[in-house]
């Protein structure tokens, strides 16, 4: 798998989204993982709703959020106000019992916040001596909603 | 009309090698998994391994590991199950499956091959 | 793996007769069960998926119920078409069967 780079601003929200064939993964419940280490395990962070006709219902841990379109094929996880220690590698994942195939490799960015002028030297950034040639950047540098913004149409 | 249609009977020697077949019709054959079962004479049914023909991704019960190389040409809407060295023991009607899906997430083999005749003696 | 184990081995009925067979996991498979049932020389029949949801054309009489560890499948009235091997199997972590159940003829 090839790891595909997705940017946030800190203290805003980053969305990643996880593309995979719908009809392989019918049926499969998915996760959210952090990689602890270049070959160490995936530790879960986030799991879509256990009945996998609910996977659109947004499941929160934290800051982190889960919703799956299960007939469109896309996973997406939202990080809600980044912050430095939220940057590195993570999996999406498709689990059928002890299984669990990764749908993505995703490294998470953190970047500084344009209009915060306090020392960014504890924001990270992959080293020098971390390879990810073949790392696909994505830019999903979202904002914060703004006071008195509404997060969803009014219904009429 | 959905199918699957396999291979015909084979008999074999033991330390021979063998590829049976497993043609899908009626349906978008490269979306669906595809299953092996194998069933001893007079016994019960036993899930060998699974393919995915889209992207040939293959799964195997612990118990096939190593034993048998399952495969497919989403060209031609065919999966295979092979043997490079047949025993005796490998005696036994195979099945292949589709796994079928449903809106509720179920998924279950819907779509059952006739079946092949494996039989190994020396 | 999961293990599947079919009880009993052989149920002997008499046709009009209720018919219970039992399948156990060896761990929670939740609603990821489905039935089969196999006639002398021909390939399994899908009869039940998602623990209690009837295949295409799958008559009445035959229904399913469980969930976790424990699933039952009842035929209300057997009729003659009926007796023959019944197979259970889990989709949750891999596809394992039971070891069947033959219902015969009492």
């Known amino acids: 798998h090839n790891t595909t780079v997705f940017q946030g601003v800190a203290g805003q929200s980053l969305q990643v989204s996880c593309p995979y064939d719908s009809m392989k993964h019918w049926g499969r419940r998915k996760a959210w993982c952090r990689q602890l280490g270049e070959k160490g395990p995936c530790q879960r962070v986030v799991s879509t709703h256990n009945l996998w006709l609910l996977s659109f219902l947004r499941r929160w841990n934290g800051s982190t959020a889960i919703t799956d379109d299960t007939l469109g094929g896309t996973l997406t996880i939202t990080l809600r106000n980044l912050q430095p220690h939220d940057a590195g590698l993570y999996q999406c994942q498709s689990l059928h019992g002890s299984e669990a195939d990764t749908l993505r490799k995703v490294l998470v960015e953190v970047l500084a916040d344009p209009l915060d002028h306090r020392d960014a030297g504890d924001l990270w950034f992959p080293g020098e001596s971390e390879s990810f040639e073949d790392a696909h950047v994505e830019h999903s540098i979202s904002r914060s909603l703004l006071e008195g913004e509404i997060p969803f149409p009014p219904t009429s | 009309e959905v199918q699957l249609v396999q291979s015909g009977a084979e008999v074999k020697k033991p330390g021979e090698s063998l590829k049976i077949s497993c043609k899908g019709s009626?349906?978008?054959?490269?979306?669906?998994?595809i299953g092996w079962v194998r069933q001893m004479p007079g016994k019960g049914l036993e899930w060998m391994g699974i393919?995915?023909?889209?992207?040939?991704?293959?799964r195997y019960s612990p118990s096939f590991q190593g034993q048998v190389t399952i495969s497919a040409d989403k060209s031609i809407s065919t999966a295979y199950l092979q043997w490079s060295s047949l025993k005796a023991s490998d005696t036994a009607m195979y099945y292949c499956?589709?796994?079928?899906?449903?809106?509720?997430?179920?998924?279950?083999?819907?779509?059952w091959g006739q079946g092949t005749m494996v039989t190994v003696s020396s | 793996e999961i293990v599947m184990t079919q009880s009993p081995a052989t149920l002997s009925v008499s046709p009009g007769e209720r018919a219970t067979l039992s399948c156990r996991a060896s761990?929670?498979?939740?609603?990821?069960l489905a039935w089969y049932q196999q006639k002398p020389g021909q390939a399994p029949r899908l009869l039940i998926y998602?623990?209690?949801t009837r295949a295409t054309g799958i008559p009445a009489r035959f229904s399913g119920s469980g969930s976790g560890t424990e699933f039952t499948l009842t035929i209300s009235s057997l009729q003659s078409e009926d007796f023959a091997v019944y197979y259970c199997?889990?989709?949750?972590?891999?596809?394992?069967f039971g070891g069947g159940t033959k219902v015969e003829i009492k």
């Open positions: 499956a589709r796994l079928g899906r449903w809106s509720s997430g179920s998924t279950a083999f819907d779509i």
């Open positions: 009626g349906y978008s054959f490269t979306s669906y998994w």
């Open positions: 393919i995915y023909p889209g992207d040939s991704d293959t």
């Open positions: 761990q929670s498979v939740s609603s990821n």
């Open positions: 998602g623990a209690s």
């Open positions: 199997q889990q989709d949750d972590d891999g596809y394992t």
